[in-house]
Interface confidence: low
């Protein structure tokens, strides 16, 4: 069997929404992968678990289900949400994602995704993770790649 | 550490402009605001605008649109204010202050200020 | 704007005993996140200004702890407790929750 490549793309979209007596931000963080089959079979993507941590904590985690197959030669884009809670040991985030009198409300959080394949009644497990920028301020729609955090650095604690 | 050098003084007629520096060192430049603060002689503290090095991105006072020009040098990290067509009421001492801005920490804001320019505008 | 009033221009206070300073906004700085944007600055005589307090109630680095902030989302207090000669000088308030920025007219710190 050939390889079946998964590349993440970027977040596409995240949209925001606080709850102000409990100091919690929420981020429903939708992300685009591209998934390649270089085999002359089809696969199934069976399942894609995915989950988004922020200062090392989880703060999100979402499964997808018998998602789709790709044909042979074939590439598909998948998109999937995480809601994300921001909250408890983490409120002081809600001071900086709410606060007007500045610009920017870039957070760097870690995306990681793990998509199972399966061809034959094989099994194939493949894992990515990335460094992202989400604004955590408003809603907001990127292009893609657009919020690639390369500098791989955690947030101030 | 962290220092913000502002010259001295300026003697400039009226009608002309001047351009004011501040020359950071000691941190970042780009992750922090730069402010600029007027206080004419005997006079309190009036805030003009301030400046994201990182973009060039802007705030002004409406009392200063017109009046007051903000820039930076990233590469000399080095701010300026641009002031034109000056009067007697111009005649202050003009101070930059640093502010954190779009990080995790903005609490500190306005920590570290120059030693001032003062400017007279005098035939 | 928002206007910030100081309504005493100074307040004379004997070494060693304690002071008052108040400051009082034209709209509540107090945001939604549970934050009052309020800056507390002193300017010694012929110095630049210097953070005191951020953020209404705390205390700016190398700040020692004689002095303190706090009030509503539109009265100001800042405290100092065992004035010290070195106080002198003339105390801001500073608005930062919305653009622009404004400072009160200033209190001045004067020594019996």
């Known amino acids: 069997p050939r390889s079946i490549d998964v590349k993440y793309i970027g977040v596409k979209s995240a949209y925001v929404s606080y709850d102000v007596q409990k100091r919690t931000i929420y981020l429903n963080i939708t992300n685009t992968l591209n998934i390649t089959n270089n085999n002359y079979y089809s696969v199934e993507v069976e399942n894609i678990t995915a989950q988004v941590q922020f200062a090392k904590t989880v703060i999100g985690k979402a499964r997808l289900n018998n998602i789709t197959h790709i044909g042979p030669l074939d590439m598909k884009q998948i998109d999937y949400t995480v809601p994300t809670v921001i909250a408890e040991e983490m409120s002081y985030m809600y001071d900086f994602c709410t606060l007007i009198s500045i610009k920017v409300h870039n957070i760097v959080l870690m995306m990681q995704v793990t998509v199972t394949t399966t061809y034959f009644g094989h099994s194939e497990q493949i894992s990515q993770e990335r460094y992202q920028y989400v604004d955590c301020g408003r809603n907001t729609t990127y292009q893609l790649g657009q919020s690639e955090y390369l500098n791989v650095l955690q947030p101030q604690q | 550490q962290v220092q913000l050098q502002q010259p001295g003084a300026e003697l400039v007629k009226p009608g002309a402009s001047v351009k004011l520096s501040c020359k950071a060192s000691?941190?970042?430049?780009?992750?922090?605001?730069m402010h600029w603060v007027k206080q004419r002689p005997g006079h309190g503290l009036e805030w003009i605008g301030n400046?994201?090095?990182?973009?060039?991105?802007?705030h002004y006072n409406q009392n200063f649109r017109g009046k007051a020009t903000l820039t930076v040098d990233k590469f000399s990290t080095t701010a300026y204010m641009h002031l034109s067509s000056l009067t007697s009421e111009d005649s202050a001492v003009y101070y930059c202050?640093?502010?954190?801005?779009?990080?995790?920490?903005?609490?500190?804001?306005?920590?570290?200020w120059g030693q001032g320019t003062s400017v007279t505008v005098s035939s | 704007d928002i206007v910030m009033t100081q309504a005493a221009p100074s307040v004379p206070v004997t070494p060693g005993e304690s002071v008052s300073i108040s400051c009082r906004s034209s709209?509540?700085?107090?945001?939604?996140?549970?934050?009052?944007?309020l800056f507390w600055f002193l300017q010694r005589p012929g110095r630049s200004p210097q953070l005191l307090i951020y953020?209404?109630?705390n205390l700016a680095s190398g700040v020692p702890d004689r002095f303190s902030g706090s009030g509503s989302g539109t009265a100001f207090t800042l405290r100092i407790s065992r004035v010290e000669a070195e106080d002198v000088g003339v105390y801001y308030c500073?608005?930062?929750?919305?653009?622009?920025?404004?400072f009160g007219s200033g209190t001045k710190l004067e020594i019996k």
């Open positions: 202050a640093r502010s954190r801005g779009g990080t995790y920490d903005y609490g500190e804001a306005m920590d570290y």
């Open positions: 709209k509540s700085l107090l945001h939604t996140n549970g934050n009052t944007y």
């Open positions: 953020r209404m109630s």
């Open positions: 500073m608005q930062h929750l919305e653009y622009p920025f404004t």
């Open positions: 000691g941190y970042t430049f780009t992750s922090y605001w």
């Open positions: 400046i994201d090095p990182s973009d060039s991105d802007t």
